[in-house]
Structures are given as structure tokens and as C-alpha cells.
Amino acid sequence: EEELQVIQPDKSISVAAGESATLHCTVTSLIPVGPIQWFRGAGPGRELIYNQKEGHFPRVTTVSDLTKRNNMDFSIRISNITPADAGTYYCVKFRKGSPDHVEFKSGAGTELSVRAKPSAPVVSGPAARATPQHTVSFTCESHGFSPRDITLKWFKNGNELSDFQTNVDPAGDSVSYSIHSTAKVVLTREDVHSQVICEVAHVTLQGDPLRGTANLSETIRVPPTLEVTQQPVRAENQVNVTCQVRKFYPQRLQLTWLENGNVSRTETASTLTENKDGTYNWMSWLLVNVSAHRDDVKLTCQVEHDGQPAVSKSHDLKVSAHPKEQGSNTAPGPALASAAPLGGSG
């Protein structure tokens, strides 16, 4: 009779984490009598996975009924596969011996690789806001995937970025891997509504990549532009001066009016106008009683935006351009009207 052969038909199999793996093994003869054992690995360090005769192997079940007299199928199913189960599995026939069974023949082995999905990419930006024309770095991380091969791309508003560096760790063998990428993005004034996207493609995702996003609104600071203008006279001897604060982001803004360098009023931006690009506009105005001044007045609109150093714009109010009424009171008095409606927003 032909000598028994141990046949493992699958050279390799690939299983998704959490699923079951079926490792096939058949023998070609019932002789010699003796048990089958399954090992992961070969040589003296091999690890027993299943012993037909003894032991407790809670994750392993046999595909066939091994108690049947003529059974020659010794395939096993391992449940709830994790990346740590990867390796080469050998089906080994032993022949009866005393006191121990004696190894008779081994199958050629089945390489089990485990596919594990990457975690959802997490994108994080810089801790502090930056202004347009500056380059900022974003990082993207995803963990727990196997096999090691993975593709990562960066996009800004649908346009692929090229300035990034990616590392997959560890460099050597591991049951699972992590990816870390850093992309450099140049900010523009129009980026309040922009998004940075990290896209990860892996064999386990069946062509449907995972994405992580970061909104540039959390990264960008667009400093305001200021314009101080003198409006036509509202009433006799009163001049309306406005400070237009334009195109700023985020909203946090405090405005101070100074008259010849002295603080007149401070207000916090409230009712803002939003521009299409996501930036904001705000306007504050003052009524100046020119008759209270003998000399020209230097009015300064000073703006502190998002905790940054103040920026300011000044306007010289020519008192001589507004002749005083005959017989009017020229004694010093309040130069700036300070009634509630006089400082406003629009």
C-alpha cells in the first residue's frame, strides 16, 4: 500500500480579523494508526494548536467528525482570528508509540495572514492659529491594520497635496501596524471654509477608503483690515467717524476708540456681517462734537483681534474745517458724544 501523505492543499490563506479561519488537511491512508496534531511553526519552538487526542483548545473545532472510523479529513477551524494568529500552520501525522506518539509525516504548511482594518484616521492641526501665507503642519494617524501595505493621501478642498511625509511603524514584523503622516499646508485668506482631508486606502477596505478631516477654520487667523472714514455732518457741529473692520476671522475682536491718544470707548464686536469666504466685517462709529475742540483731533481706531497685538488706524479731524456758531459756548466740554447709540455696528 502507498505510504500515507499529509495534504495541506492551501499554501496560504488570508482571513479578516474577527472571522474564522479554516485550515484544510487530509491524509491519504488510515495507516499507520495514530493521531493528528496541528502546530504553528516548525522546529523545536513550534506551538501546539490542536491535539486530536488530548488538551483543551477552546477556539479550535474540527470540520469533520474525527470519531468516524474512516475519517481522513483533519481540517480545523479557528474562531475569532486576530493578527496575532498569523503564521504557518502544519498538520502533522503521528504514529502510535510507547510511551509517546512518534511524528510520522508533516503537511507542507499553510501560511495564515490576517487582514485587519485600519482605525478611522485622526487628523490634528497646530496648537496655535496661523495667518495666511504661513505654512502649517497637519498630522494624520491610523492604527491596527494588517498587512503592512497601505496608501495615504492628503487633500485640501479636493486637491491632492504633495508636501507630506509618511511612516508606517514598526519597520519590522508586527501583528499589526500604524501609519503616521505629516502634511504641510500653506494658508490663504480664503481658507476659513477649507478642509484638509487624510485618506487611507487598505486591502481590507474594498476600495472604500477611510477619511479623516480637519477644518482650517480651527487653524487660520485672518487679521482684519481697518479703514477710518469721516461721514458727512449729521447735525450742526457733529461729525460721524466710522471704523470699518473687514475680512477677519475668528470673530473674537475688541475695538477701542482713542481721542488724541486717550481712551474714549472700548467695545466688543457683536453683530457681525459674514462674508462668503467665512470672514467677518464689523463697523463702529462715533459722533464727534467738533465745536468742543479748538485744535485738530486725532481719532484712532484700535483693534485687538483674537488676542493678538493691537492694530490701529488713525484719522485727523480738522476742526478748522467746521466754523463755530456765533455765540456758542466755547468752554471745554465732552468732545465725543457718548450716548448709547453713538457706538454701533452695522
Epitope: R40, G41, A42, G43, P44, G45, R46, E47, A86, G87, T88, Y90, V92, R95, V102, E103, F104, K105, S106, A108, G109, G172, D173
Partner: antibody, heavy 122, light 112 residues
Framework: QVQLQESGPGLVRPSETLSLTCTVS????????WSWIRQPPGKGLEWIGF???????FYNPSLKSRVTISLDTSKNQFSLKMTSVTAADTAVYYC????????????????WGQGTTVTVSS | DIVMTQSPLSLPVTPGEPASISCKSS???????????LDWYLQRPGQSPQLLIY???NRASGVPDRFSGSGSGTDFTLKISRVEAEDVGVFYC?????????FGGGTKVEIK
């Protein structure tokens, strides 16, 4: 193809600890045994021990009390530590890859490092 | 431990001629699965050892077919059908059946 590179100090003082690292490049740690073998000047080869990719270690009984082999799969490296060295430990130390795919035995030490000379002297 | 004994200690050879080295083990290297776990290595001067034969008779990848291994149980032989100048060096047998792995003392092959 797979290459092995030993690294570590070339001179060790008597009674101190010899530490060597072998870096595996161009291949996987998985499914192999990773061995240390030494060769005293003008003499034959002596097996020190090996570690399987699953972490199981095997040592030469004559050296076992002084030897530890460890594996860092994340760096594709394995290491040898030998304590309480004497002049008799002066040798060329080789790291090597051992194949296994047929039962309990081993199927050839098929890749060797170029060897690093370690001298034990005060 | 399994003791490995090689002979001869030194082997002067003529290029183009055959050569033979013997290796004996203190216990059988034939495992119950039918494999004989014996390797042959060549260490050329100033180089690391190189695997020639494993499992007694299987030639390693890239090894010229002038090298062949035979034997089973405790007696093994390495044959070189036609020695070439590049074959000079020390040949070692090693048992790979059980730990500790043990080497023979080596056979130095040199050109006459």
C-alpha cells in the same frame, strides 16, 4: 535578499557583559529561528543559542547560565547578552537565520552575518 | 548532547579530482518523519560559513551540483565530484535534529 549585520563593542573587559545586536534587512523575522554562533580564533564553530519568531529561546547548556537572546520584531533585530565574560569568550560572533519547515528539526542555517570580532581583555 | 566527528582533519586535493568527507554522529539523526537532520557548511578563508546541504542530501539554493550529500542514521558523507580552486576552506557538518546544535570539528580542504 536577506542580509544580517552584527553590531556591538569589539572589546569587553573580563567579568563584564558582552552585548551584540543583529539587524535583519530585506526580509521578515516571521517563521525563522535567529541564531548566535561563535568561533574562537583558529577553532571550530560553537552554537550559542537561538530564538524563534514566537519568542521561544533555546540555549547551549554549556552557556545557558550566562546567555540571554532577545528579539525585537518591530526593529527587525535580535540581540545576544553574555554575562561574566572571560578570555575564553574571545571569538568571532556570527548571527544567522535558521529555517524550519519539516517537523521538529531544522532545515539549514542559510543566511549568516559577516561576523564581529569580540576580544575579552583588560 | 550529540557529538559530531569529522574525518579527515585535513584533505589535500587536486583540482578536477573528486573528494569526500565523512561525518559521524553519536546518535541517529534520522527523525521519525523520514528526514535526516544533518547540514554541511563551507567556510572559505576570511568568510562566514555558507550552507551547502541540509537534511543530509538537499542542496541549498545556488550551490553547484558538484556538491552532494548522502547517508542516514549516524553516517554521512559530503562528496565533491570535481574539486575547484574556490572550494578551499573548512567544511563543517552540523546536526540539526535537537538542541544544542553541534558541529563537527571541521575538515580543511586545500589544494595540493
Amino acid at each position: 535578499q536577506v542580509q544580517l549585520q552584527e553590531s556591538g563593542p569589539g572589546l569587553v573587559r573580563p567579568s563584564e557583559t558582552l552585548s551584540l545586536t543583529c539587524t535583519v534587512s530585506g526580509g521578515s523575522i516571521r517563521n525563522y529561528y535567529w541564531s548566535w554562533i561563535r568561533q574562537p580564533p583558529g577553532k571550530g564553530l560553537e552554537w550559542i543559542g537561538f530564538i524563534y519568531y514566537n519568542g521561544r529561546t533555546f540555549y547551549n547548556p554549556s552557556l545557558k547560565s550566562r546567555v540571554t537572546i532577545s528579539l525585537d520584531t518591530s526593529k527587525n533585530q535580535f540581540s545576544l547578552k553574555m554575562t561574566s565574560v572571560t578570555a575564553a569568550d574571545t571569538a568571532v560572533y556570527y548571527c544567522a537565520r535558521v529555517r524550519a519547515y519539516s517537523g521538529i528539526g531544522l532545515d539549514g542555517t542559510d543566511v549568516w552575518g559577516q561576523g564581529t570580532t569580540v576580544t575579552v581583555s583588560s | 548532547d550529540i557529538v559530531m566527528t569529522q574525518s579527515p582533519l585535513s584533505l589535500p586535493v587536486t583540482p578536477g579530482e573528486p573528494a569526500s568527507i565523512s561525518c559521524k554522529s553519536s546518535q541517529s539523526l534520522l527523525y521519525s518523519n523520514g528526514y535526516a537532520y544533518l547540514d554541511w557548511y563551507l567556510q572559505r578563508p576570511g568568510q562566514s560559513p555558507q550552507l551547502l546541504i541540509y537534511q543530509g542530501s538537499n542542496r541549498a539554493s545556488g550551490v553547484p551540483d558538484r556538491f552532494s550529500g548522502s547517508g542516514s542514521g549516524t553516517d554521512f558523507t559530503l562528496k565533491i565530484s570535481r574539486v575547484e580552486a574556490e572550494d578551499v576552506g573548512v567544511f563543517y557538518c552540523m546536526q540539526a535534529l535537537q538542541t544544542p546544535l553541534t558541529f563537527g570539528g571541521g575538515t580543511k580542504v586545500e589544494i595540493k
